[in-house]
């Protein structure tokens, strides 16, 4: 005869475990139903009655099958230097990531705890390593024959234009100035940019009213064991 399917709650056979989506209740000494993601246990099972589950209340969630008495609280609203890439729902916590132009200086299990503005390389310095979602920009001095005349977190050092006759020689922060109207070779006008990390925004987000002013977090951050690279600015 085929074995009968046991309905929760039931006493497990000695040495056996409860089935998937069930848990062993020590008090009742029975296998009982877990609650689904988005729910929590309102009433624990007894020998004669199964777990009673309730829906997670506003701004709380459970991501897994569970028998917790209360759902977990969603994290606080994203700060002004962040974007909400995943909204708080019954089944998932809110995730905040840094907005463009910022990077995550202190991460957490999901998302970012503390964002900081990407370093800007001052004139005479260009971007050696672009910023990412989790790392700051690294600046380097412009090598001879190259320059950067901007304060930017994306501009690299560009070659000086080559003149037939040089009026003013170029330096690390200024392009060469030619006497003739047309140089032999020049770079395309405009600064050369490196791509910035882009935060992806999920389709379902909850609007977060931003405060009109938010203090900069950059002063809170240690810049590592050594002082910041020369040629960087804090803002």
């Amino acid at each position: 005869l085929p074995a009968q399917v046991a309905f929760t709650p039931y006493a497990p056979e000695p040495g056996s475990t409860c089935r998937l989506r069930e848990y062993y209740d020590q008090t009742a000494q029975m296998c009982c139903s877990k609650c689904s993601p988005g729910q929590h246990a309102k009433v624990f099972c007894t020998k004669t009655s199964d777990t009673v589950c309730d829906s997670c209340e506003d701004s709380t969630y459970t991501q897994l099958w569970n028998w917790v008495p209360e759902c977990l609280s969603c994290g606080s609203r994203c700060s002004s230097d962040q974007v909400e890439t995943q909204a708080c729902t019954r089944e998932q916590n809110r995730i905040c990531t840094c907005r463009p132009g910022w990077y995550c200086a202190l991460s957490k299990q999901e998302g970012c705890r503390l964002c900081a503005p990407l370093r800007k390389c001052r004139p005479g310095f260009g971007v050696a390593r672009p910023g990412t979602e989790t790392s700051d920009v690294v600046c380097k001095p412009c090598a001879p024959g190259t320059f950067s005349n901007t304060t930017s977190s994306t501009d690299i050092c560009r070659p000086h234009q080559i003149c037939n006759v040089v009026a003013i020689p170029g330096n690390a922060s200024m392009d060469a100035v030619c006497t003739s109207t047309s140089p032999t070779r020049s770079m395309a006008p405009g600064a050369v940019h490196l791509p910035q990390p882009v935060s992806t925004r999920s389709q379902h987000t909850q609007p977060t009213p931003e405060p009109s002013t938010a203090p900069s977090t950059s002063f809170l951050l240690p810049m590592g064991p050594s002082p910041p690279a020369e040629g960087s600015t804090g803002d």
Partner: antibody, heavy 118, light 106 residues
């Protein structure tokens, strides 16, 4: 377009049962929880319960436990609510409504009028 | 369960007039949600997370409040705003609705 189409009006006798349906169109049925709400005689609204189609689990308002049973048929993207042991107190318009995983009913069905009369 | 009390139950306003209706909760709630319902129609989502307007809701509507006291305001009444408005919470199970404020046009 995101819509919830409910079954037509029902006239039932006291003590009988009725099963009303709510068919979802143009969205992934299992991604949205389905709630049922009662509105008696144009008055206020009462939440009956919720079903999570992805998991088949339910939560009920204590007041409607034993009165309402919520089920889903994923193959037809349809949610059902069965009402048992009907009395005149159960005469109302019943709505299905999705909540998108949040705590707010963002799409409502067309409503089903249930009249209990001998 | 949390009881939501809406006031006034019935009000009328002239076109262009500012309208404010309130929703008071018996216990503190995290957010309030609002719906508009017209006769022989299903409720429509109107305001969510206390102050965010649902899609298609005119900018003359606004929502505010915290704790146990919330309100819906229309900056300048229009004829199409005549309807019944319900508040709703889900900070505690079961979710509950207010008894509604019926807004008429003068």
């Amino acid at each position: 377009e995101f819509q919830l189409q409910q079954s037509g009006p029902e006239l039932v006798k006291p003590g009988a049962s009725v099963k009303i349906s709510c068919k979802a169109s143009s969205y992934s049925f299992t991604d949205y929880n389905m709630n049922w709400v009662k509105q008696s005689n144009g008055k206020s609204l009462e939440w009956i319960g919720i079903i999570f189609p992805k998991y088949g689990t339910t939560s009920y308002n204590q007041k409607f436990k034993g009165k309402a049973t919520l089920t889903v048929d994923q193959s037809s993207s349809t949610a059902y609510m069965q009402l048992n042991s009907l009395t005149s107190e159960d005469s109302a318009v019943y709505y299905c409504a999705t909540d998108g995983g949040t705590w707010y009913f963002d799409v409502w069905g067309t409503g089903t009028t249930v009249t209990v009369s001998s | 369960q949390i009881v939501l009390t809406q006031s006034p139950a019935l009000m009328s306003a002239s076109p262009g007039e500012k309208v404010t209706m309130t929703c008071s909760a018996s216990s503190s709630v995290t957010y309030m949600y609002w719906y508009q319902q017209k006769p022989r129609s299903s409720p429509k989502p109107w305001i969510y997370l206390t102050s965010n307007l649902a899609s298609g809701v005119p900018a003359r509507f606004s929502g505010s409040g915290s704790g146990t006291s919330y309100s819906l305001t229309i900056s300048s009444m229009e004829a199409e705003d005549a309807a019944t408005y319900y508040c709703q919470q889900w900070s505690s199970n079961p979710p509950t609705f207010g008894s509604g404020t019926k807004l008429e046009i003068k």
